[in-house]
């Protein structure tokens, strides 16, 4: 875990400025865990951050992530009805100036330090159709989701909407 007091003292002020000209509609500081209740943790190793999926000890504090939610219009499908859909996109930041990024070439999820405007690789389409879990689809690669593979986060291709209930791409958000 970070062990940085700034993580716990994270405030909205850090993310008040607009991203790609759009301000978040809301922000939420939450711990992220897998469908099977393993925690997503972040550790500083050799001057870069690593992301782990692990069982925490009983009283170990969970790392928090700031989720910033954005509205995005996307074009209608081939139905020809001409109506745009409104979807939610999210960025995930576990500490100041660092955001989760999709590395589509390596099929990996990485923490990158970057300035605003954030690149498209930092944006994920939010899905929460599976009861009270969420999943994160790459903006840059539709059909590819953040998932769990070998105790790490990875990018996982999902073939159809029926497979959105696959446990390894489902995550839980919690204030505690």
């Amino acid at each position: 875990a970070f062990g940085i007091s700034g993580v716990q003292k994270y405030t909205r002020a850090l993310h008040d400025s607009s991203i790609t000209g759009i301000s978040p509609i809301t922000e939420y500081l939450a711990s992220l865990s897998t469908y099977n209740d393993q925690s997503i943790t972040f550790a500083l190793e050799d001057e870069s951050y690593e992301i782990y999926v692990e069982d925490l000890k009983k009283d170990e504090k969970k790392d928090k992530v700031l989720l910033s939610y954005y509205e995005s219009q996307h074009p209608s499908n081939e139905s020809g009805d001409g109506v745009d859909g409104k979807m939610l996109m999210v960025t995930l930041s576990p500490t100041k100036d660092f955001w989760l990024h999709a590395n589509n070439k390596e099929h990996s999820v990485e923490l990158h330090k970057c300035e605003k405007p954030l690149p498209d690789q930092a944006f994920f389409v939010l899905h929460n159709m599976h009861s009270n879990c969420v999943s994160f689809e790459c903006k840059t690669d539709p059909g590819v989701f953040i998932g769990v593979k070998d105790n790490h986060l990875a990018l996982i291709k999902v073939d159809s909407s029926e497979n959105l209930c696959t446990e390894n791409i489902l995550f839980k958000l919690s204030e505690t």
């Epitope: 809301t26 939420y28 109506v83 979807m87 939610l88 939010l126 159809s160 909407s161 029926e162």
Partner: antibody, heavy 122, light 107 residues
Framework: EVQLVESGGGLVQPGGSLRLSCSAS????????MNWVRQAPGKGLEWVTA????????YYADSVKGRFTISRDNSKNSLFLQLNSLRAEDTAVYYC???????????????WGQGTMVTVSS | DIQMTQSPSSVSASVGDRVTITCRAS??????LAWYQQIPGKAPKLLIY???RLQSGVPSRFRGSGSGTDFTLTISSLQPEDFATYYC?????????FGGGTKVEIK
């Protein structure tokens, strides 16, 4: 114009069944989760059930679990609610309602139908 | 389940008045709260979503705020067409739940 039109309501005896329909137009129906919400006479709103855009996820209020079934036919832009083992307390106006966001429940219901009345009485 | 408690259950006000309705959740959640207006005999209409986002076409006199457990709908200057019943709804987790409603009546 974005529109939802319910049909199928009526008078039914306790223990009986009914099938409600909701016809959607003006938006990409398959992209959105859909809901049924009811309102008993003189009472407030009660969420009943929801279904994801693909139809793969369905969710129910405890009060109707095991008795009501939600389904959809995306090829016909239609939403359905099968009501079985009806009770007097199921008497209400039933509304179908569209989610604000594609692929997410978070935004509430931005489009509502006009409602269809279901009366359960002997 | 998240219970939503609205207050007051009814309020008498005059045209031009400022009206405030509150909604309290039994447990804290993010900002996924919606407000609806319902005129008797009509379907509900979405006013506010994500706690503070004004739905397209809704007059700016309606304002939503709050997060966690406490949310507020404010009508800055009541108009004749605003006399109706207002409901909050949490859209955070299943089962989705509504508040009991607040009836805004003419004084």
């Amino acid at each position: 114009e974005v529109q939802l039109v319910e049909s199928g309501g009526g008078l039914v005896q306790p223990g009986g069944s009914l099938r409600l329909s909701c016809s959607a137009s003006g938006f990409t129906f398959s992209s959105y989760a859909m809901n049924w919400v009811r309102q008993a006479p003189g009472k407030g709103l009660e969420w009943v059930t929801a279904i994801s855009g693909s139809g793969g996820g369905t969710y129910y209020a405890d009060s109707v679990k095991g008795r009501f079934t939600i389904s959809r036919d995306n090829s016909k832009n239609s939403l359905f609610l099968q009501l079985n083992s009806l009770r007097a307390e199921d008497t209400a106006v039933y509304y179908c309602a569209k989610q604000t966001y594609t692929s997410s429940w978070y935004g509430g219901f931005d489009i509502w139908g006009q409602g269809t009345m279901v009366t359960v009485s002997s | 389940d998240i219970q939503m408690t609205q207050s007051p259950s009814s309020v008498s006000a005059s045209v031009g008045d400022r009206v405030t309705i509150t909604c309290r959740a039994s447990q804290g959640f993010s900002s996924w709260l919606a407000w609806y207006q319902q005129i008797p005999g009509k379907a509900p209409k979405l006013l506010i979503y994500a706690a503070s986002r004004l739905q397209s076409g809704v007059p700016s006199r309606f304002r939503g705020s709050g997060s966690g457990t406490d949310f507020t709908l404010t009508i800055s200057s009541l108009q004749p067409e605003d006399f109706a019943t207002y409901y909050c709804q949490q859209a955070n987790s299943f089962p989705l739940t509504f508040g009991g409603g607040t009836k805004v009546e003419i004084k």
